[in-house]
């Protein structure tokens, strides 16, 4: 079949990095600058991806493979093949359309990306709060109050006076 195909279609002999040039009697011509063909038998070369602005070049384009981008520091990749770059925030914040905003009281984010998540509710597991939560860290649950030896007490969280926070968008 391959032999038959190559007799019928001279383009099938054109390797990756070239294209079958109809303007030149179907001769295999090298891909022009800033273009590539990753498979043989192509009738055109694809334009190389340009990594600029929020994107930076991770791998240069070659005649046989597309460029690969990642994000300029301060941003991180989203999507297949880093199709988008999204702003980093500080720990204790989440990204909204208004930019980076502090986590609301009772929520935390220990990463530079993602949303603020509620502190663990220790009492749901019958445990007590050993270490209070912050904007950047979840609470640490300790043994259940019944497990504590007489005289010992768990760390109780402060009265829930709301600190200036930000509702997730």
């Amino acid at each position: 079949f391959e032999r038959t195909r190559s007799l019928q279609d001279p383009c099938s002999n054109c390797p990756a990095g070239t294209f079958c040039d109809n303007n030149r009697n179907q001769i295999c011509s090298p891909c022009p600058p800033n273009s590539f063909s990753s498979a043989g038998g192509q009738r055109t070369c694809d334009i190389c991806r340009q990594c600029k602005g929020v994107f930076r070049t991770r791998k240069e384009c070659s005649s046989t493979s597309n460029a690969e981008c990642d994000c300029t520091p301060g941003f991180h990749c989203l999507g297949a093949g880093c199709s988008m770059c999204e702003q980093d925030c500080k720990q204790g914040q989440e990204l909204t359309k208004k930019g980076c905003k502090d986590c609301c009281f009772g929520t935390f984010n220990d990463q530079k990306r993602g949303i603020c998540r509620p502190w663990t509710n220790c009492s749901l597991d019958g445990k007590s709060v050993l270490v209070n939560g912050t904007k950047e860290r979840d609470v640490v649950c300790g043994p259940s109050p019944a497990d504590l030896s007489p005289g010992a007490s768990s760390v109780t969280p402060p009265a829930p006076a709301r600190e200036p926070g930000h509702s997730p968008q």
């Epitope: 602005g53 929020v54 941003f75 989203l78 999507g79 199709s83 988008m84 770059c85 999204e86 702003q87 990204l95 909204t96 359309k97 968008q169």
Partner: nanobody, 123 residues
């Protein structure tokens, strides 16, 4: 081909003003949130401002609030950044960038940006 081209940068004295422009080709600007981001010398990229499709929502990083104004002219497929009361710390390369499909709903990713225009604030 989808493209963004910034212009309007230059050298300006502290307290001065500049207006940056961004021309969009290959797509319809009115379908997208648009953003300005900047990169100061030796620093990471910083988000500056964004504007929704019809211009009714505009948001700014704290450091430029009251000094910068983002606007758009969808009929001209153009985005703008009016910068006033400029400070030395505003010195940077400014990029316009398109919010990707679904921006503001489940992500804040930018999928297209230009080559940038340089703003230098110095006496």
């Amino acid at each position: 081909q989808v493209q963004l081209v910034e212009s309007g940068g230059g050298l300006v004295q502290p307290g001065g003003s500049l207006r940056l422009s961004c021309a969009a080709t290959g797509f319809t600007l009115s379908n997208y949130w648009m953003n300005w981001v900047r990169q100061a010398p030796g620093k990471g990229l910083e988000w500056v401002a964004n504007i929704n499709q019809d211009g009714s929502e505009r948001y700014y990083v704290d450091s430029v609030k009251g000094r910068f104004t983002i606007s758009r002219d969808n009929a001209k497929n153009s985005l703008y950044l009016q910068m006033s009361s400029l400070r030395a710390e505003d010195t940077a390369v400014y990029f316009c960038a398109r919010g990707g499909e679904g921006y503001g709903v489940n992500h804040y990713g930018l999928d297209v940006s230009g080559q940038g225009t340089t703003v230098t604030v110095s006496s």
